[in-house]
Structure formats: C-alpha cells, structure tokens
Amino acid sequence: APVRSLNCTLRDSQQKSLVMSGPYELKALHLQGQDMEQQVVFSMSFVQGEESNDKIPVALGLKEKNLYLSCVLKDDKPTLQLESVDPKNYPKKKMEKRFVFNKIEINNKLEFESAQFPNWYISTSQAENMPVFLGGTKGGQDITDFTMQFVSS
C-alpha cells in the first residue's frame, strides 16, 4: 500500500525556518518575505513505529529529493543527518528505525523524538543560522518545539 504522506514546512518556537545548508545539512534562521521560498518542504510520511495515544511515528523526507532525516551514532553520540535513499524504495510504511520520529503534540506545538534514541529530539539553537541537530535535553537552552504549516501538493 502506498504510504500516506503530507507536505509541510516546520518552524521552531522562535519562528525560525529550516533551510538547506550544503547538500546534507539543515540550518535554522529567521526568514521574511520572498526569502520564505528558501525553506525546505518536508514530505511527512506516516509509518509503522511504536505508536501510542500521544506519539505518532513519522518519517521526514525532503520533498522531491531522495533525502530523509535519520538518526545514527557518530563518535558514540546520537546524531541527526540527512541520508540519501533509493527513490524507488522510499518512502515505505516499514521504514528502518533510524528514519522514524515520534511526532508528539503538546499545547499546539510539535516535538520530534527519535525512535532510535528515545528522549533525543530534533532541535535548533537559540542562535541564528546554526545547524538543526539531535539534542538530548528538553526545556533547556535549545529549542525542541516546532509548528507545522501544511503545503498543498
């Protein structure tokens, strides 16, 4: 069965948008006006995972690119990366665990917890123009709350 997907953009709780920074990295910065066109559009796919009543497993691909956010160990630390995949095989309902994030909605904000590394979240820095990363703390300096904007196909 084709996996159910929707197109969206994400902004962190400080209203920073996500843009490409080189071929395999995202960064977060404030955008206005025509610059908003730079923000990445995600194809969010609803996949199998350890679903609960308040966690929905999703995969986050870049629209019309064969790139997916994934979580891997680098130097013994959970790390967020953009990983290239074979477009003939992705997206799929049974994504490998490193591609799966638990989408958690709290007070109209979204968190994205790594399925591979529980309690590690897609995060941005307070500072402008810094890479999007996988952070192991919530409620500290780094930002783990996002809003989602739907984009028509």
Partner: antibody, heavy 122, light 107 residues
Framework: EVQLQESGPGLVKPSETLSLTCTVS????????VSWIRQPPGKGLEWLGL???????YYNSPLKSRLTISKDTSKSQVSLKLSSVTAADTAVYYC????????????????WGQGTLVTVSS | DIQMTQSPSSLSASVGDRVTITCQAS??????LNWYQQKPGKAPKLLIS???TLPPGVPSRFSGSGSGTDFTFTISSLQPEDFATYYC?????????FGQGTKLEIK
C-alpha cells in the same frame, strides 16, 4: 522459553475496577511490548491495547477512558486496570507478547498467556 | 480502524479434507496478517505470520497466502487435532483488529 501468565480476581462487582497482572518470563519488558486482549464467553477476540518497551501505551478507542496499562519491568509484570465495569466486561482476558520486529512484523503477537476469566456480577 | 471480514463463520469437514478460510481487510494491509488457532478453553496459538510465514514447530499442512486486502488460510489435509476456531489478525496499523473467527467442526 517465553511464557506469560495472567492473574487476578475472577469476580468483580459492577462499577468497580478490574485489575489483572501479567507475569512474563523468557523475555525482557524493556525490549518487547505486551498487548491485552479479551474474549467474552462464546464470542470473538477484542484487542484492548498495549504497552511498549519504552513504557508508552496505546489504548483502543472504545475503552480509552476506562483503561490503564502499566508495567514494573524489574518484576517482569504488566498490569491492566479497567474502571467502571459492567456485565459487558465479563470475558477471558489474555496478555500477549508483541513480535516487535522493526521493518518486518512490528505489531504482531506471537506468544499468549493462558487467559483468566473475569466475571462482572454483584 | 481496519475492519477484518472472515468467512465462513463455521465449517464442517472430515479428516483428510482440504480446508480454506478467507479474510478480507477494509483497506490495503500489505502482508501484515496473522492467523491463530484456538481450541476450547485455551489461548490462541500463532500459526501464520506475515500472511505466509510458518513459525518454528507449526506443521507444514498449514499455509497462508495473499496480500493487500484478500487473504487465504489453508489446511491441506485435516488432522483430528485441527478441529478448532481460527482467527485472522491485521497487524498493519493500530488498533489491531481480528476477524470474527471460523469454527471448524467435524462433519
């Protein structure tokens, strides 16, 4: 060898809370989810909900407001609590181990307990 | 929720017969379908996972096929110990849902 065993009172009064325990061996509750299923006398199987290795829970909608599933990993026990019971909750209650094979069979159930009959009656 | 329609609800057959039970899903579930056998007073036992895979120790007279929405469970040659109730389960999405069951009786 994987084993699951349900235990709890066989008789519960209407409006009270049904409490059952599933004691497991042969696998760790850190690594595998456990589901609860029930079967009213002479009827089919109804899936109630599950608890994952992480401790996160998923409850089937019709029972969501009355159902609580929790676990004590160190005791290898999973608990089910169903509040405000009526005669319609009379059933054999089973716990079952989730297959938990990512990318293959994440949601299937491979081993079941023998079940325990709970009667709701005053 | 995904609805599972199992048929027939009951079936009479003799030892040595070939028996087929079907299960239809209300939406495409790929191959995420399990079959269970339940004998009176006992817990269900997994016979087939992922539509066609036999777990270790399950006799080869049991088989499963299908994908998408239509699935079939077959016993190639009925044995006396096979008289029981059989259930399908979709394990594609939560909540998990069972078919209504097929009671296999001796003719």
């Amino acid at each position: 060898e994987v084993q699951l065993q349900e235990s709890g009172p066989g008789l519960v009064k209407p409006s009270e809370t049904l409490s059952l325990t599933c004691t497991v061996s042969g696998f760790s509750l850190r690594d595998y989810g456990v589901s609860w299923i029930r079967q009213p006398p002479g009827k089919g199987l109804e899936w109630l909900g599950l608890i994952w290795g992480s401790g996160d829970t998923y409850y089937n909608s019709p029972l969501k407001s009355r159902l609580t599933i929790s676990k004590d990993t160190s005791k290898s026990q999973v608990s089910l609590k169903l509040s405000s019971v009526t005669a319609a909750d009379t059933a054999v209650y089973y716990c079952a181990k989730q297959t938990n094979i990512w990318g293959y069979d994440l949601y299937g159930m491979d081993y079941w307990g023998q079940g325990t009959l709970v009667t709701v009656s005053s | 929720d995904i609805q599972m329609t199992q048929s027939p609800s009951s079936l009479s057959a003799s030892v040595g017969d070939r028996v087929t039970i079907t299960c239809q899903a209300s939406q495409d579930i790929d191959m995420d379908l399990n079959w269970y056998q339940q004998k009176p007073g006992k817990a269900p036992k997994l016979l087939i996972s992922q539509a066609n895979t036999l777990p270790p120790g399950v006799p080869s007279r049991f088989s499963g096929s299908g994908s998408g929405t239509d699935f079939t469970f077959t016993i190639s040659s009925l044995q006396p110990e096979d008289f029981a109730t059989y259930y399908c389960l979709q394990s594609d999405w939560l909540p998990l849902t069972f078919g209504q069951g097929t009671k296999l009786e001796i003719k």
